[in-house]
Amino acid sequence: SGTTNTVAAYNLTWKSTNFKTILEWEPKPVNQVYTVQISTKSGDWKSKCFYTTDTECDLTDEIVKDVKQTYLARVFSYPAGNVESTGSAGEPLYENSPEFTPYLETNLGQPTIQSFEQVGTKVNVTVEDERTLVRRNNTFLSLRDVFGKDLIYTLYYWKSSSSGKKTAKTNTNEFLIDVEKGVSYCFFAQAVIPSRTVNRKSTDSPVECMGQEKGEFRE
């Protein structure tokens, strides 16, 4: 058979952040190429990344069509230069991926503190509403647009001169925290989806401190 030198893909892994979704697998090909197929549980298979020597395939365009669906992918192995060749069962070797539900599993990207403004003893902190690759009516939706109230943010803040952190939470992208007048504070934010069982939290945003460029002070 022409498939004696082909090996099935293995370690199929979904890598997804803010719905940017790539399927990765092994091994690096030697005298073989791969094609990926993806489908929903009830849908038809759609082929992507035809006869590639890569060991990854960007499936974002497919999963953003409905991020609440559950997807399955499979990776076919073909002999290089003889892609019509099939295995002993009459079809090429392939391996299935784990199931993947983007809405429940995509990693939350690192948030960014967009701005902060002090007015007296209050500081308004705004977290940037990251754009995703999910579309509706020809526009890209933000993380908030997609997750709605399932997404909260936690703000950790502390006096620059001490280490004791306080926290605030919000169902929007804004905080309004109490501070001492004339005292500098630092803070970072974290995105959280409390209802999830996996990938509940993002990594921490970069730390911002009052007195830096993003800040604004008003008496």
Partner: antibody
Framework: QVQLQESGPGLVKPSQTLSLTCTVS?????????WSWIRQHPGKGLEWIGE???????RYNPSLKSRVTISVDTSKNQFSLKLSSVTAADTAVYYC??????????????????WGKGTTVTVSS | EIVLTQSPGTLSLSPGERATLSCRAS???????LAWYQQKPGQAPRLLIY???TRQTGIPDRFSGSGSGTDFTLTISRLEPEDFAVYYC?????????FGGGTKVEIK
């Protein structure tokens, strides 16, 4: 000042689909609030049905999820409720409400602060 | 589902008296998501208290909310004639959002 008005048939036959629309006036449906449906069975308490954001993001009560669809039409400043396969147990006053952010404890949380007057829907043949 | 149990079911009091309404949750509720509503016959509910203790704009200061975890209380310090109504607690932190069964405050 934002006002909400429910509209739709007051009588629906069993097994059919109940369809209601809520028209938002005095404000934009796209202004960062959520929009909810709640019902109240005769002489009983309140039951949350579900909510929608202008982007189309939805949350539903799991007990009704298989029968409920909430949609939004930003061009008409309206959102709608569809409840399929209705029975007499779906007879109730149906309210639409705005879920707006209020400051509390360092952050902002959503509460239903503006309600429609409610519309009575009877399921009967 | 978080079950909110309100007690008493009915409270019979006279104008000028103090009303204490209880709301107990089947599991801990973040105070940020706890609200109280007032409903009069033939009307939609009206938001009174949010964040367990913060009065909505325009709500008289005779209404106050307190509590945390699983036990929350709405107090009306001195009942006015217009306060006789049904009061509901609600949690909006966990889907499905749920309401208590209501406490009817009626004129004695």
């Amino acid at each position: 000042q934002v006002q909400l008005q429910e509209s739709g048939p007051g009588l629906v036959k069993p097994s059919q689909t109940l369809s209601l629309t809520c028209t938002v006036s005095g404000g934009s449906i796209s202004s960062g609030q959520y929009w909810s449906w709640i019902r109240q069975h005769p002489g009983k308490g309140l039951e949350w049905i579900g909510e929608i954001y202008y982007s189309g993001s939805t949350r539903y009560n799991p007990s009704l999820k298989s029968r409920v669809t909430i949609s939004v039409d930003t061009s008409k400043n309206q959102f709608s409720l569809k409840l399929s396969s209705v029975t007499a147990a779906d007879t109730a006053v149906y309210y639409c409400a705005r879920d707006a952010p209020y400051y509390y404890g360092g952050g902002y949380y959503y509460y239903m602060d503006v309600w429609g007057k409610g519309t009575t829907v009877t399921v009967s043949s | 589902e978080i079950v909110l149990t309100q007690s008493p079911g009915t409270l019979s009091l006279s104008p000028g008296e103090r009303a204490t309404l209880s709301c107990r949750a089947s599991e801990s509720v973040d105070s940020s998501y706890l609200a109280w509503y007032q409903q009069k016959p033939g009307q939609a509910p009206r938001l009174l208290i949010y964040g367990a203790s913060t009065r909505q704009t325009g709500i008289p200061d005779r209404f106050s909310g307190s509590g945390s975890g699983t036990d929350f209380t709405l107090t009306i310090s001195r009942l006015e004639p217009e306060d006789f109504a049904v009061y509901y607690c609600q949690q909006a932190g966990v889907v499905p959002y749920t309401f208590g069964g209501g406490t009817k405050v009626e004129i004695k």
